[in-house]
Interface confidence: low
């Protein structure tokens, strides 16, 4: 068990043309907000596949009120790390996706609106109680800065967490067979209950007897490494089954190198071996430019002339990601208007509109009224991609063509009598009420009252009219 | 402009503890990684870990200071402090602060302090 | 942990001369070196991050070359105030680790 831990640095316009606007406005102030999904494995999942190694919501960052005229700055961030709590071994490779968030805090009906700003994702080998790793990636224009790292919570240790420390009974040495637990000198590894033979450095149990082998390693005791010529399905931490990375033990057990590097063991510790236009302790600088051709599905490449400015990738309809490199669920950003259905077609995106609404987003209100009359002198409205007639008085139905009965409805009050008429109708008032629907009633000195008395009060109660 | 400006020189006995500040300014204070060197007299430079004043929690420590020093942060202020324990004479040394080039990344160090004399004597 | 090597330990040269300084690394550090010049009383200043890029307000007299294991810094005429001792460093891994130093002397 132990916990992995992301700290945001920076979220803001990236370096290069392009710079996004704020995503906050005086009219329209709003703070972010951070979600982290971690899964094992180097795998290429969805962003909706679920977050198997666990997720984490920050806290919500400084209110941002943006200055007319004003650059997008770097936005106020929320305090605190995120932590990823894992109950079993950390695999030691682990693909995360961390998503920006913003909370609108204009008059919103219903409380505060959410909008995804940007999503970043990116596979890493990680050891457990290693040092903090530096990371920068790009979403579109925006640029995030962050580190992370892995730690397990005591009793466990280890680059998994797996092996299993605890107090020494003598103060001076541990019981037979036992060794003194690195880096925790005054403590005792625990006694094994694995399976005899299980590797102590790729495998691992949860139960007596058994031997669950960490990612990159195989057979019965994890002692065989996994064949590198076979890059097969994303797995978890105890399928390891096949797959295409060798961790060795030791300082690159869970490659430490971010961005593709390549580990290799020193006597003390270890080296990455970066991949062109990547630098840095563990890989985790990025100095490509466009003549590396980092942009995928074609997407095209801005500025980058040295690795000192970076370049942005322009993805086409459909892709997204620094490198252009995921597909986009373009449906998500709910781009059909007025209930319109999305169909995400690969190549393009449909729109399927209600009856009333065309358009490629569905955006076009049809003329509802447009060839279609109203009888008899009535009016028609437009509303909700159909129509209705207002109708003239003494006219009803869809179209207004039905004679209506003006007296259907019952308009006169208290027992007033109903005639229709030329021009509409007329109440007849019984005795001691007046007004056009029989609706006031008239004081014994001659002077008509409010409005009459609410339903379930007679004219006779005591009631006073505010 | 950038500036870090470090505490004035201290004086310790062996077994003590020496706690040495670094005051940034011109700058946003808690995005930016500051390394600890030291530098023995006549000697080389000597890397001892670093801290990101976003979060105190997170620093990295060179394995052969692990158990002795302590880098915490105060963002009112703008400081980040090194604390030193079970001092040696051999930990007499002008200690550095110095900033990392970019925000949370490089490792690289760009603007740096005057330097801190700990002078450890019995 | 990685050991830098520089030599030679002290170069006398004049002003206006060509100084050419060598930082060895113990294993390959691809390109994750830099270079530091110190003065007396003083803090180092970075002078190349990167083996080869140049720092704001550096002059275009100090450049860096190399990859892999060996490294060179070099500086193409010497002015009187780039007499000091200078330093490399490596980021490529834990601990970072500097050279001993070269001393650069008014011959």
């Known amino acids: 068990a132990g916990v992995f831990e992301l700290q945001i640095h920076s979220f803001g316009p990236g370096p290069g043309p392009g710079a996004p606007r704020s995503p906050c406005s005086a009219r329209l102030p709003c703070r972010l907000f951070f979600r982290v999904c971690l899964k094992p494995g180097l795998s290429e999942e969805a962003a909706e596949s679920p977050c198997a190694l666990g997720a984490a919501l920050s806290a919500r960052g400084p209110v941002y009120t943006e200055q007319p005229g004003a650059p997008a700055p770097d936005l106020p961030l929320p305090d605190g790390l995120l932590q990823v709590p894992f109950r079993d071994a950390w695999p030691g490779t682990f693909s995360f996706i961390i998503e920006t968030w913003r909370e609108e805090l204009g008059d919103q009906i219903g409380g505060p609106a959410w909008s995804l700003l940007a999503r970043v994702a990116g596979r890493r080998r990680l050891a457990a109680g290693g040092p903090w790793a530096r990371d920068i990636q790009r979403a579109g224009a925006w640029e995030l800065r962050f580190s992370y790292r892995a730690r397990c919570e005591p009793p466990a240790v280890g680059t998994a967490c797996t092996r299993l420390c605890r107090p020494r009974s003598a103060p001076s040495r541990c019981g037979p067979g036992l060794r003194p637990c690195a880096p925790l000198e005054d403590e005792c590894e625990a006694p094994l209950v694995c399976r005899a033979g299980c590797s102590p450095e790729h495998g691992f149990c949860e139960q007596p007897g058994e031997c669950r082998c960490l990612e990159g390693w195989t057979g019965p005791l994890c002692t065989v490494p996994v064949s590198t010529s076979s890059c097969l399905s994303p797995r978890g931490p105890s399928s390891a089954t096949t797959g295409c990375l060798v961790p060795g033990p030791g300082p690159c057990d869970g490659n430490p190198c971010a961005n593709g590097g390549s580990c290799s063991e020193t006597p003390r510790s270890f080296e990455c071996t970066c991949p062109r236009g990547f630098y840095g302790l563990r890989c985790e600088v990025s100095g490509v430019t466009c003549a590396d051709g980092p942009c995928f599905n074609g997407g095209l490449c801005v500025g980058g002339a040295d690795p000192d400015s970076a370049y942005i990738c322009h993805c086409p309809p459909g892709f997204q990601g620094s490198n252009c490199e995921k597909r986009v669920d373009r449906c998500s950003l709910q781009p059909c208007r007025n209930g319109g259905l999305c169909l995400d077609l690969g190549h393009a995106l449909r729109c399927r509109c209600r009856a009333g609404f065309a358009g490629p987003r569905c955006e076009h209100d049809l003329d509802d009224c447009a060839g279609r009359a109203c009888a008899n002198g009535g009016t028609c409205v437009e509303g909700g991609g159909a129509h209705r007639c207002s109708c003239a008085l003494g006219f009803g139905g869809r179209d207004c063509r039905e004679r209506a009965d003006p007296c259907a409805a019952r308009p006169c009050a208290h027992g007033g009598r109903c005639y229709a008429h030329f021009s509409g109708l007329v109440c007849a008032c019984a005795p001691g009420y007046m007004g056009a629907r029989c609706e006031f009633p008239v004081h014994p000195d001659g002077a008509s009252a409010l409005p009459a008395a609410p339903p379930g009060l007679r004219p006779g109660d005591p009631q006073r009219y505010l | 402009q950038v500036q870090l400006v470090q505490s004035g020189a201290e004086v310790k006995k062996p077994g003590a503890s020496v706690k040495v500040s670094c005051k940034a300014s011109g700058y946003t204070f808690i995005s930016y990684w500051i390394t600890w060197v030291r530098q023995a007299p006549g000697q080389g430079l000597e890397w001892m870990g670093d801290?990101?004043?976003?979060?105190?929690?997170?620093?990295n420590y060179n394995e052969k200071f692990k158990s002795r020093v302590t880098m915490t942060r105060d963002t009112s202020t703008s400081t980040v402090y090194m604390e030193l324990s079970s001092l040696r004479s051999e930990d007499t040394a002008v200690y550095y602060c110095?900033?990392?080039?970019?925000?949370?990344?490089?490792?690289?160090?760009?603007?740096w302090g005057q330097g801190t004399l700990v002078t450890v004597s019995s | 942990e990685i050991v830098l090597t520089q030599s030679p330990a002290t170069l006398s040269l004049s002003p206006g001369e060509r100084a050419t300084l060598s930082c060895r690394a113990s294993q390959s550090i691809n390109n994750n070196l830099h270079w530091y010049q110190q003065k007396p009383g003083q803090a180092p200043r970075l002078l190349i991050k990167?083996?080869?890029q140049s720092i704001s307000g550096i002059p275009a007299r100090f450049s860096g070359s190399g990859s892999g294991t060996d490294f060179t810094l070099t500086i193409s005429s010497l002015e009187p105030e780039d007499f000091a001792v200078y330093y490399c460093?490596?980021?490529?891994?834990?601990?970072?680790?500097f050279g001993g130093g070269t001393k650069l002397e008014i011959k």
């Open positions: 990167y083996v080869s």
């Open positions: 460093q490596q980021t490529q891994s834990w601990p970072l680790t």
């Open positions: 110095a900033r990392e080039t970019t925000v949370g990344g490089a490792y690289a160090m760009d603007y």
């Open positions: 801290i990101y004043p976003g979060s105190g929690s997170t620093t």
